[in-house]
Structure formats: C-alpha cells, structure tokens
Interface confidence: medium
C-alpha cells in the first residue's frame, strides 16, 4: 500500500488491527489513551485497552458487525467518554464528550497538557525492577508505555514502540547478568535521555503543524531532507515530503493507528526505492521495523553531488523567473529550498527557511516593479547577514563554553535568559536553561561544517519547549511574541533580547534561599538544579546585578554547602551558616 | 505526485540518430527549467543539456555541443533530445531530471546504446 492510498474499508478498526498486528495494535491504544487521559490510573488504561482490543477482534472477524463501521475517533472517543470520574478528575475537559466528532477530538486535543502535575518518576532499586519484569513482562512494559506517554502526551508513538523494544531488551539482557545495575542502569539514563530528547523534537512538529499549519512543516521538510538526501530528484522529495507530512499530521492529531500503519508503509516506500534517495539506506533498510523506521529518520547526510551548477542560474539570471514564480509559487520555492539546501547541509534547517523567506519576499516586491530582474539581480547579497548572524553567535558561544565548561555555561545562560524574561517560573527557567546550555557539549565538538545545524536546530527544539509550557500560562509579552511571530526567527527574537527595564524585580524572601541538610544526599544534578534555582531567584530579586557580583554569591553558596555538607551536625550548620549566607549576599548585591 | 517518464532510447549505430521524449505530470511543467542527464554504469550522473521553462535558452556539456538539441513542448508536457552524430561514447543511460539538478529521478531511465 502507498502511503496516499486509503481503501475502502469496511471497518477501519479491522484493518487498522490486521495491519498492525494484536500487540502494536494495543501498544499504539494504550498511548493514546494516556496521551488524552493524562491523569487516569494505569489498571483503567488497561481495562479500556482490552476492551477495544476485544472489540476490534469482533470487527476482524465480520467486518459488518455492530458499531465496526465507525471512525476511529467515535469508537475512542466514546470509550473514554465512558471514565466514570471524569468531571472530577479533569474538570473542563469532560465538556468535550457532549460534542459530536470532530469537535470531541479537536477539544481532548487542546486539553493534553505539556507539564501535567505528576509525581517524578523515580527509578527503584535494580532488584526490584528485575522481579518486577520478571514476574509480569507484558504489564510491566505496558507501564512503561503508560508512564512516558502520560508526561510527553505528543511523544512519537511509533517511536515510542521502538523505545519500549529497547527498554526490554535491557532488562531481558541485565536482569542475567553478573552486576545487573552495572548492565543496566547506563542503558535507563541513554533510553531516559534519548527519550527526552526525542520527545522534545516531536512537540516542535507538532507545534509547527498545529501553529504555523502544513505549509510550514513541509518547509521544514523539503529543507531537511533535501540536505539528507541530496541525489535524490526534487520529485522524490517533494513525495516524501507529502507522505511525511500525512505521517505527522495523523500523530499529532492522535491518529496513531494510521500514523504507525503510515510509517511503516513510508520506510517500505524508502527502502524499495533506495537508489533514487540515498546511498546511506542500505544498513537501515536491513533492520526490522522499528529500527528500520527510527535509522531511516537519523540516517547521516549522503555525499552531494558533483559538479552541482550555480544556484544563481534558474533563480536569479533567468529572465523567467518572476513567470515560474508566478505561475507556481510553492512549487517554485520548494525548488529553490530544496537546491539551496542540498548544496548546504553546513547551514540549519531554520537559516535555510530564513533565506527561503527572504527570497519570495524579495520576488513578490520585485516581480511587480517596472524591472523586476533589476530589483532582484542582488537577492543572494541579502543572504550574507542571515548567514553570519548564527555562524558568529555559535562561534561565541562555543569559546564561552569551551572556557566554562557545561555547568558554568549553563549558568550564564540561566542569568542571560532570567533578565530577558524575568517574569517565567524559575522551574520553566531553570529546565530551559539547562537545556540550551547543553548545546554546547552537544554540538561544540562538531567541525565548523556541522556547527550550526546541529546547534541551531537543537536551540529551535529547546526554545519550543519555552514556547509551549509559556502558552499553558501565560506571563510574558515578550515570549509570546517571539514564540507566535515567526517559528523560523524564534532563537534570533530571543537572542536579541535586551534585559526587561519594565521589570520589577521579586520581594527578597529568605525562605527561598533557605537550604537542608537534605541537599547533600541528592545526585549531583539535582544539586546542581538546587544552585541554579537559586541563582535565577537571585537575578529576579536583583536583575541589574552585575557577572561578578551574581559570581561571588553562587561561589560562597558553594562553598556554604560543601561546608555543611561535611559537618558533624549538617542541619544545625545548614540553619546558622545559611543566616549568615543570606546575610552576607544581601550585602553583596545590595539588596 | 511528480513524474518523469523517459522514452525513445534504443540501439543505433555510429554516426546515427536518436529522439529521446520525457512526458512530466503531476506539476506545472512550463515553470521550470529541465535537464537531461546521462549515466554510465558504475559511475557518477553527468549533466547533458538543460532548458528553460519557455524554452528560449537551452545550454550543453562540451562533449554533447553541435550534436545534440534540447526542446520541449509545454502543451504537451514533454521534454525531448534530439541526439545526432552518435558516438559510441554516447551509449549511457539517460534521464530527465527538473531543473539542473543530475540527481536520479524515481523512474526508469532510457538507454542509448551506441555500436556497430
């Protein structure tokens, strides 16, 4: 089946069953149902699962029997219309089951929450988690899908089915050996990081879906795998583009039946037509599903072509290109996007579609004056700033880095970002912070070549994080601007932030710097989160304090802790050096 | 969806004649400029001709120029080389691609193969 063609089914339950079979099939349910009932407990998840799990084999099995002609969406959403606890448990969004589909769908999809007031996962001990799997396989699996799909309610679900595949073969492989926590516990933090990460790319698909509409995601794309698959014909992309886009479309929208059925018929798509896409496939297309799909999506850049003549030819020295414009004008920028970014897969996805927009700006004013080639002949020169600004923020940022290390790093961009947005909860700013900070490790390392789409399109994914948890409340004016204008020129409206002189700055509140002796016992980074949340308190209360300043207070909080920590009597030491701490900042920044 | 199906290629001998034809749906065909690329086997694309969207400014690779003519007819939706003087260096597969690009298109090329 091609990805386009959807046959007349009787019942779209039943073939949705038979084309994913019985566990993919209640994997894919149960995610959905926790992505939309994010507070529900696991055993109602279950119960639910089993029951259209059942229901679907009725449909299998005679494809006219009561209720199997219905939509997906009907037999889903009428299923978890039937919680008995709704209105108590979810407030507002019980309001949803009395509209019709595809108003109910629309109003479980606006009420999925991006920070949902759940417990933190913590991981029991190896031994525990070891009887656990053992004892009941199949449900603890199910958990995990549970618990990920309930905090990260727009994660990838097909993709989340290869993370559990993984999550199992860690404990089928560690549960026997010899150290257990040594086997497994490095393979938990990779899935848990991979996971977050993944996670965290998927919700800007699907904000560039649901905010900016399909234009902009098949933008995103054209620009992305035209880089990665840059012997492939505008016409393979332009293909692949389509089908991806429906890919995604479904899964954001809780399609997740028909997104999985979908990708998987896309990877065959690929891998069957290899020689015309990429030579990099071949290993890919050797793995079984899941991992085929997931290697596909990561596959590296294959080589560009040779001998690839000037851009300038058929986009600016054509005496025909206002008529190609005008008389095809996605089509005619798909083409520019895709031959600019397969001649530069040095430059992000976000500064291609900068040069993208600034070149159709450009047509639309120059194809309507009295010389259009004229007006447009030095539209590549107004490419040159566009480009340098990334390239010359990377290379500061990188030496900062690289003369800070991650956590110093980490902290300076905590203070940077406090000023520009002081009114966003220190927890948001804390989380967001770490995370841009990470690009360095992350990207530092990279030659110049791969600098800036590793570094720019990994900040675009962070700063959607910001995007999204700010939208649920709403504070500042200056995010909501940079989130909502453009999705492309996000990080450069937040770069060009200048501290908030319209701020004012937060009542000192010696609670807030009031440590225990509970700190010492945390993980490293959850001291670290400890210090960093102080350090944006600090800067809320006193935003005009300088770096060395902000500086000397984190150092002697440092040492306040390293002290007490080492103390007979942490606690006593904790509540008399922390006075005199407090006092002593107060001092320092002049509060 | 885009396409691209290429024709007309066959046996001929040296110093003989070849049409090839590439019939293009599923996009506006007269904005864009196309191409005709050839392959040999084993080895990279190599870019033959190119023609703008109105077909008033065609453009050849040195070892093709004075041979072969590029045209196309935009009613019809179809691209076409005219191939005089063959060589036996000519015997490749051939394809269109839009544009300049001399990446493989999806579909089958023709093949050309010039011998006595």
């Known amino acids: 089946r091609g990805v386009f063609r959807r046959d007349a089914h009787k019942s779209e339950v039943a073939h949705r069953f038979k084309d994913l079979g019985e566990e993919n099939f209640k994997a894919l349910v149960l995610i959905a149902f926790a992505q939309y009932l994010q507070q529900c407990p696991f055993e109602d998840h279950v119960k639910l699962v089993n029951e259209v799990t059942e229901f679907a084999k009725t449909c299998v099995a005679d494809e006219s029997a009561e209720n199997c002609d219905k939509s997906l969406h009907t037999l889903f959403g009428d299923k978890l219309c039937t919680v008995a606890t709704l209105r108590e448990t979810y407030g507002e969004m019980a309001d949803c089951c009395a509209k019709q589909e595809p108003e109910r769908n629309e109003c479980f999809l606006q009420h999925k929450d991006d920070n949902p007031n759940l417990p933190r996962l913590v991981r029991p001990e190896v031994d525990v988690m070891c009887t656990a799997f053992h004892d009941n396989e199949e449900t603890f699996l199910k958990k995990y899908l549970y618990e990920i799909a309930r905090r990260h309610p727009y994660f990838y679900a097909p993709e989340l089915l290869f993370f559990a595949k993984r999550y199992k073969a860690a404990f089928t492989e560690c549960c026997q050996a010899a150290d257990k926590a040594a086997c497994l516990l490095p393979k938990l933090d990779e899935l848990r990081d991979e996971g977050k990460a993944s996670s965290a790319k998927q919700r800007l698909k699907c904000a560039s879906l649901q905010k900016f509409g399909e234009r902009a995601f098949k933008a995103w794309a054209v620009a992305r795998l035209s880089q990665r698959f840059p012997k492939a014909e505008f016409a393979e992309v332009s293909k692949l583009v389509t089908d991806l886009t429906k890919v995604h479309t479904e899964c954001c929208h809780g399609d997740l039946l028909e997104c999985a059925d979908d990708r998987a018929d896309l990877a065959k798509y690929i891998c069957e037509n290899q020689d015309s896409i990429s030579s990099k496939l071949k290993e890919c297309c050797e793995k079984p599903l899941l991992e085929k799909s997931h290697c596909i999506a990561e596959v590296e850049n294959d080589e560009m072509p040779a001998d690839l003549p000037s851009l300038a030819a058929d986009f600016v020295e054509s005496k025909d290109v206002c008529k190609n414009y005008a008389e095809a004008k996605d089509v005619f920028l798909g083409m520019f996007l895709y031959e600019y970014a397969r001649r530069h897969p040095d430059y992000s996805v976000v500064l291609l579609l900068r040069l993208a927009k600034t070149y159709e700006t450009t047509l639309e004013k120059c194809c309507a004056a009295a010389d259009p080639h004229e007006c447009y002949a030095k539209v590549f020169d107004e490419f040159k700033p566009l480009v340098e600004e990334p390239q010359n923020l990377i290379k500061q940022n990188c030496e900062l880095f690289e003369q800070l290390g991650e956590y110093k790093f980490q902290n300076a961009l905590l203070v940077r970002y406090t000023k520009k947005v002081p009114q966003v909860s220190t927890p948001t700013l804390v989380e967001v912070s770490r995370n841009l900070g990470k690009v360095g490790s992350k990207c530092c390392k990279h030659p110049e070549a791969k600098r800036m789409p590793c570094a720019e399109d990994y900040l675009s994914v962070v700063l959607n994080q910001l995007c999204v948890l700010h939208e649920k409340t709403p504070v500042s004016d200056r995010v909501t601007k940079c989130c909502t204008e453009s999705l492309v020129n996000r990080r450069p409206c937040f770069s060009a932030l200048e501290v908030d002189e319209t701020y004012v700055p937060k009542e000192f509140n010696a609670e807030t710097f009031t440590f225990h002796a509970d700190i010492c016992t945390l993980s490293e980074k959850e001291r670290q989160i400890k210090k960093q949340t102080a350090l944006v308190e600090l800067v809320k209360h006193k935003p005009k304090a300088t770096k060395e300043q902000l500086k000397a207070v984190m150092d002697d909080f440092a040492a306040f802790v390293e002290k007490c920590c080492k103390a007979d009597d942490k606690e006593t030491c904790f509540a008399e050096e922390g006075k005199k701490l407090v006092a002593a900042s107060q001092a320092a920044l002049g509060l | 969806a885009v396409q691209l199906v290429d024709s007309g290629g066959g046996l001929v001998q040296p110093g003989g004649s070849l049409r090839l034809s590439c019939a293009a749906s599923?996009?506006?065909?007269?904005?864009?400029?196309m191409s005709w690329v050839r392959q040999y086997p084993g080895k990279e694309p190599e870019w033959v001709s190119s023609?703008?969207?109105?077909?008033?400014?065609?453009r050849y690779a040195d070892s093709v120029k004075g041979r072969f003519s590029i045209s196309r007819d935009n009613a019809k939706n179809t691209l076409y080389l005219q191939m005089n003087s063959l060589k036996p260096e000519d015997t490749a597969e051939y394809y269109c691609t839009i544009g300049r690009s001399v990446s493989r298109s999806r579909t089958q090329g023709t093949q050309v193969t010039v011998s006595s």
């Open positions: 023609i703008n969207g109105r077909g008033d400014d065609t």
């Open positions: 599923g996009f506006s065909f007269g904005s864009f400029g």
